[in-house]
């Protein structure tokens, strides 16, 4: 439906508070280095302009597109060239090229200082002094560090952030109340950001068809009682929402997401029996709840898939008439019967089915050719099952930290050219699959594990894309979205890698390690482990374990010493020498 003024339309639909928050998120995600105050000023100017358009949709410039209005506003930033370099060239372009240019300059790993959490009293004072500024600053800091964060979901996080401060700043023990809540929000936020990053990568790198296939599979698992036509409608609407958010159209995205939640709740009876509680919540909670809702029960007595997709005489006719619809029906029918499969496995099965039909429907005897297609699925199903079984056994044997270390070694040997911080971050996250998924029963392990690994490997892919250093990473990341994990799993030690020169400075530690949190200390040790493997890729597990055990003992000893710094200096030299000898460096 055409509106005379798009900006007035969105302002009225979303309300002033959400409008301002979403514009702030949009601007912070585009200009990630700009100071908070500059963004607030721009947002206020856009908001005042929007209000004039609400009052009179025919007023000057009110008919302009949101991209034009927002892009013009961003291009008024005085320091654009100095701060962003070539991104300033975007401003010489016309829409829609200008917006595409801004999107291409989003930085997944911006050079921003780590967010340090102030003392609880300091935070509570800031919250009480100016609640609005405090919450805006939260949106700004998250959005600039996570330029693809799902904007309507960030509004939900901000609402929870506000609730945590409102409750805990009045509590007797503010810290005990607030800190666990902030930790939970931080961890959930990182997970939410990574999940959304995969959706955007799917759309931007592999296209709408790939995203729709993912959505058909996931929604069919979640809503197995819904008809195919209903699932198809939800997929179309969901694709529009995510295309908009990934494209920087945050106002449209939030508006359409609200409409989708409304539609789902109005049509619960034909979608899922699990939506009742979600649909009683306010908008932001409702949308979040729907996105996380558990799978509905499978309908009883679903017929065999073979009847429609192998035995029917109409298989090739139906496929030829509407390929994507027929494959969509296959994916829907398979997914609703298999909540125990990962989405990526379901997509691999659908791809195998498609490849078989492409070959067989052009053959002399199509039916004879595709009759055994379901037999081809067996190894595809068994591969992730076996991998998960093996890795869960290893996790249970080692615990999370040592399991992460095993993965660090494994992945450093596969792709040693990747930067150490990236290898540490990605391997630590890969290792979290153990505590996240291995506790589940068999029927829930694969969807938990493999779909989580897809999210984590996408982090590796987007970080590597910024500064590509490994052809093997590029190949696994770009060839097939659904085969990324098997591609990385299949990589062996990179025999072409020339070991890194030994640098004693890399293995020099100081007393500051003693004051670090357990997590930070682990990261220091894991960084050293990656560097060790880069120096000695052929080192055995036993050699590496011995060196790491010595290292842990060294840190523990020096942190207990009276003169910590001297201990680190003297014992450190001994440790380096002993490690070099042990590894034959």
């Amino acid at each position: 439906d055409a509106h005379k003024s798009e900006v007035a339309h969105r302002f009225k639909d979303l309300g002033e508070e959400n409008f301002k928050a979403l514009v702030l998120i949009a601007f912070a995600q585009y200009l990630q280095q700009c100071p908070f105050e500059d963004h607030v000023k721009l947002v206020n100017e856009v908001t005042e302009f929007a209000k004039t358009c609400v009052a009179d949709e025919s007023a000057e410039n009110c008919d302009k597109s949101l991209h034009t209005l927002f892009g013009d506003k961003l291009c008024t930033v005085a320091t654009l060239r100095e701060t962003y370099g070539e991104m300033a060239d975007c401003c010489a372009k016309q829409e829609p090229e200008r917006n595409e240019c801004f999107l291409q300059h989003k930085d997944d790993n911006p050079n921003l200082p780590r967010l340090v959490r102030p003392e609880v009293d300091v935070m509570c004072t800031a919250f009480h002094d100016n609640e609005e500024t405090f919450l805006k600053k939260y949106l700004y800091e998250i959005a600039r560090r996570h330029p693809y964060f799902y904007a309507p979901e960030l509004l939900f996080f901000a609402k929870r952030y506000k609730a945590a401060f409102t409750e805990c700043c009045q509590a007797a023990d503010k810290a005990a109340c607030l800190l666990p809540k902030l930790d939970e929000l931080r961890d959930e936020g990182k997970a939410s950001s990574a999940k959304q990053r995969l959706k955007c990568a799917s759309l931007q790198k592999f296209g709408e068809r790939a995203f729709k296939a993912w959505a058909v599979a996931r929604l069919s698992q979640r809503f197995p009682k819904a008809e195919f036509a209903e699932v198809s409608k939800l997929v179309t609407d969901l694709t529009k929402v995510h295309t908009e958010c990934c494209h920087g159209d945050l106002l449209e995205c939030a508006d359409d997401r609200a409409d989708l939640a409304k539609y789902i709740c109005e049509n619960q009876d034909s979608i899922s029996s699990k939506l009742k509680e979600c649909c009683e919540k306010p908008l932001l909670e409702k949308s979040h709840c729907i996105a996380e809702v558990e799978n509905d029960e499978m309908p009883a007595d679903l017929p065999s898939l073979a009847a429609d997709f192998v035995e029917s005489k109409d298989v090739c006719k139906n496929y030829a008439e509407a390929k994507d619809v027929f494959l969509g029906m296959f994916l829907y029918e398979y997914a609703r019967r298999h909540p125990d499969y990962s989405v990526v496995l379901l997509l691999r099965l659908a791809k195998t089915y498609e490849t078989t039909l492409e070959k067989c429907c052009a053959a002399a005897d199509p039916h004879e050719c595709y009759a055994k297609v379901f037999d081809e699925f067996k190894p595809l199903v068994e591969e992730p099952q076996n991998l998960i079984k093996q890795n869960c056994e290893l996790f249970e044997q080692l615990g999370e930290y040592k399991f992460q270390n095993a993965l660090l070694v494994r992945y450093t040997k596969k792709v040693p050219q990747v930067s150490t911080p990236t290898l540490v971050e990605v391997s630590r996250n890969l290792g979290k699959v153990g505590s996240k998924c291995c506790k589940h029963p068999e029927a829930k392990r694969m969807p938990c594990a493999e779909d989580y690994l897809s999210v984590v490997l996408n982090q590796l892919c987007v970080l590597h894309e910024k500064t590509p250093v490994s052809d093997r990473v590029t190949k696994c990341c770009t060839e097939s979205l659904v085969n990324r994990r098997p591609c990385f799993s299949a990589l062996e030690v990179d025999e072409t890698y020339v070991p890194k020169e030994f640098n004693a400075e890399t293995f020099t530690f100081h007393a500051d390690i003693c004051t670090l949190s357990e997590k930070e200390r682990q990261i220091k040790k894991q960084t050293a482990l990656v560097e060790l493997v880069k120096h000695k890729p052929k080192a055995t597990k036993e050699q590496l374990k011995a060196v790491m055990d010595d290292f842990a003992a060294f840190v523990e000893k020096c942190c207990k010493a009276d003169d910590k710094e001297t201990c680190f200096a003297e014992e450190g030299k001994k440790l380096v020498a002993a490690s070099q000898a042990a590894l034959g460096l």
Partner: nanobody, 123 residues
Framework: QVQLLESGGGKVQPGGSLRLSCAAS????????MVWVRQAPGKGLEWVST????????VYAESVKGRFTISRDNAKNTVYLQMNSLRAEDTAVYYC????????????????RGQGTLVTVEP
């Protein structure tokens, strides 16, 4: 909007040949499967033949197999039906059709269809 325009029908003797054409517009022809269906006087729609988007897959009803050939030219947005060894029972209005989003595959009443071209086979 989707438009399908059939041509090439006419009156022919048993054993004769005709070539039907269907010019398509208003949709992405090169990514759409195309279908010929027919309706004999006083009967329902009957599927005749299907061709995939890239022309690699062609499927025929048993009643026309070996006599009819479906083909397409994606550069011209046109689909063809070459009909040889025509029989009296082939007499019908022939429609060119393509899948309409939201319809059931094979439910030809719901597909986009042209106005049809009449083929009459009689001595």
């Amino acid at each position: 909007q989707v438009q399908l325009l059939e041509s090439g029908g006419g009156k022919v003797q048993p054993g004769g040949s005709l070539r039907l054409s269907c010019a398509a517009s208003g949709f992405t022809f090169s990514t759409s499967g195309m279908v010929w269906v027919r309706q004999a006087p006083g009967k329902g729609l009957e599927w005749v033949s299907t061709i995939s988007d890239d022309a690699r897959i062609t499927v025929y009803a048993e009643s026309v197999k070996g006599r009819f050939t479906i083909s397409r030219d994606n550069a011209k947005n046109t689909v063809y039906l070459q009909m040889n060894s025509l029989r009296a029972e082939d007499t019908a209005v022939y429609y060119c059709a393509t899948y309409r989003a939201g319809s059931r595959i094979g439910s030809y009443e719901d597909y986009y269809r042209g106005q049809g071209t009449l083929v009459t086979v009689e001595p």
